[in-house]
């Protein structure tokens, strides 16, 4: 079944833009002028998930790229990375649930919990041009929180 | 506050053209989803389509072909451009505010636009 | 493509009644349900979404339930202001959204 999908970029609370940081890693960092044409495109997509009562799932792929943010158990700990797909197959309403995030959206913030890993966060360091990762904790020191932009093409 | 305003409303023979405009204030469009929804007098609302960024715009299946959304988020503006107009196209238009990306529910809508198709 | 069916279409009933107006969906839709309210010349207002949850400024007479393909819409105390069109939404069907008819509520 066809999917609603999106062309967007996401910068954290604090400004920072989401950037590519080798094939298989997004960092993020403060961009300016025309460095901010080195932000990811990110195709959101609505896909099926649990029922709850306002968290809406998504999964992040890379515009144009057959990449997808997926979570997964490495060495015992909830990892994010960018994983291969074949393009012919996504996106789709039925995502396998390392590709799902329950995008939580309060006072045009976001959030974007793994569902995968329930209350683990897409998250950014306060430190620039570190990796963007999956975080287990909300309201600490790692920025969880996201503003996102439509992207005209 | 936040206010949705449609304009571009009016009698319009069959066959012909118009485009319905929705202007926002209190909140910017660069990441907010619309849709325009319409009614027929006396009956129920039928939605027509939504646009997210400029290049993802989805509609019902009767819209497609004829009916056209865009945006130009400099003048935090919607569009709703429609051809081939039928006696049956006959309505109120509103735009609306998704009320969260992909939520699917509208949670600000616009007074309406009437269009009336006829000769 | 999903088709929204509310029933009944036509209900009449006095202040202070409860009043409960369902909607069926051709297949299930999880809880991806909306309710309207909209009055004669008006826009609709956002009365419930994800089948339960009340929408801001909705007063607690409002409720909503149901999951999958049975959903419903209670007024548990029917107030003057009340007597409008209401209708039902699927929100998360694919790339389109379909409304049920509508239910009028009148006065008996």
């Known amino acids: 079944a066809p999917v609603r999908s999106l062309n967007c970029t996401l910068r954290d609370s604090q400004q920072k833009s989401l950037v590519m940081s080798g094939p298989y890693e997004l960092k993020a960092l403060h961009l300016q002028g025309q460095d901010m044409e080195q932000q990811v495109v990110f195709s959101m997509s609505f896909v099926q998930g649990e029922e709850s009562n306002d968290k809406i799932p998504v999964a992040l792929g890379l515009k144009e790229k057959n990449l997808y943010l997926s979570c997964v158990l490495k060495d015992d700990k909830p990892t994010l990375q960018l994983e291969s797909v074949d393009p012919k197959n996504y996106p789709k309403k039925k995502m396998e649930k390392r590709f799902v995030f329950n995008k939580i959206e309060i006072n045009n913030k976001l959030e974007f919990e793994s569902a995968q890993f329930p209350n683990w966060y897409i998250s950014t360091s306060q430190a620039e041009n570190m990796p963007v990762f999956l975080g287990g904790t909300k309201g600490g020191q790692d920025i969880t929180d996201f503003t996102m932009q439509f992207v005209s093409s | 506050e936040v206010q949705l305003v449609e304009s571009g409303g009016g009698l319009v023979q069959p066959g012909g053209s118009l485009r319905l405009s929705c202007t926002a204030s209190?909140?910017?469009?660069?990441?907010?989803?619309m849709a325009w929804v319409r009614q027929a007098p006396g009956k129920g609302l039928e939605w027509v389509g939504i646009i997210y960024d400029s290049a993802s715009t989805y509609y019902a299946s009767w819209a497609k072909g004829r009916f056209t959304i865009s945006r130009d988020t400099s003048k935090n503006t919607v569009y709703l451009q429609m051809n081939s107009l039928r006696a049956e196209d006959t309505a109120v238009y509103y735009c609306?505010?998704?009320?969260?990306?992909?939520?699917?529910?509208?949670?600000?809508w616009g007074q309406g636009t009437l269009v009336t198709v006829s000769s | 493509e999903i088709v929204m069916t509310q029933s009944p279409s036509t209900l009449s009933a006095s202040v202070g009644d409860r009043v409960i107006i369902t909607c069926q969906a051709s297949?299930?839709?999880?809880?991806?349900l909306s309710w309207y309210q909209q009055k004669p010349g008006k826009a609709p207002k956002l009365l419930i979404y994800?089948?339960?949850t009340l929408a801001s400024g909705v007063p607690s007479r409002f409720s909503g339930s149901g999951s999958g393909a049975e959903f419903t819409l209670t007024i548990s105390s029917l107030q003057p202001d009340d007597f409008a069109t209401y209708y039902c939404?699927?929100?998360?069907?694919?790339?389109?959204?379909?409304f049920g008819q509508g239910t009028k509520l009148t006065v008996l």
């Open positions: 297949q299930s839709i999880d809880n991806w």
């Open positions: 609306a505010r998704e009320r969260q990306i992909f939520s699917g529910d509208m949670a600000g």
């Open positions: 939404q699927n929100t998360g069907g694919g790339v389109s959204i379909a």
């Open positions: 209190g909140f910017s469009l660069s990441s907010a989803a």
């Open positions: 994800r089948a339960s």
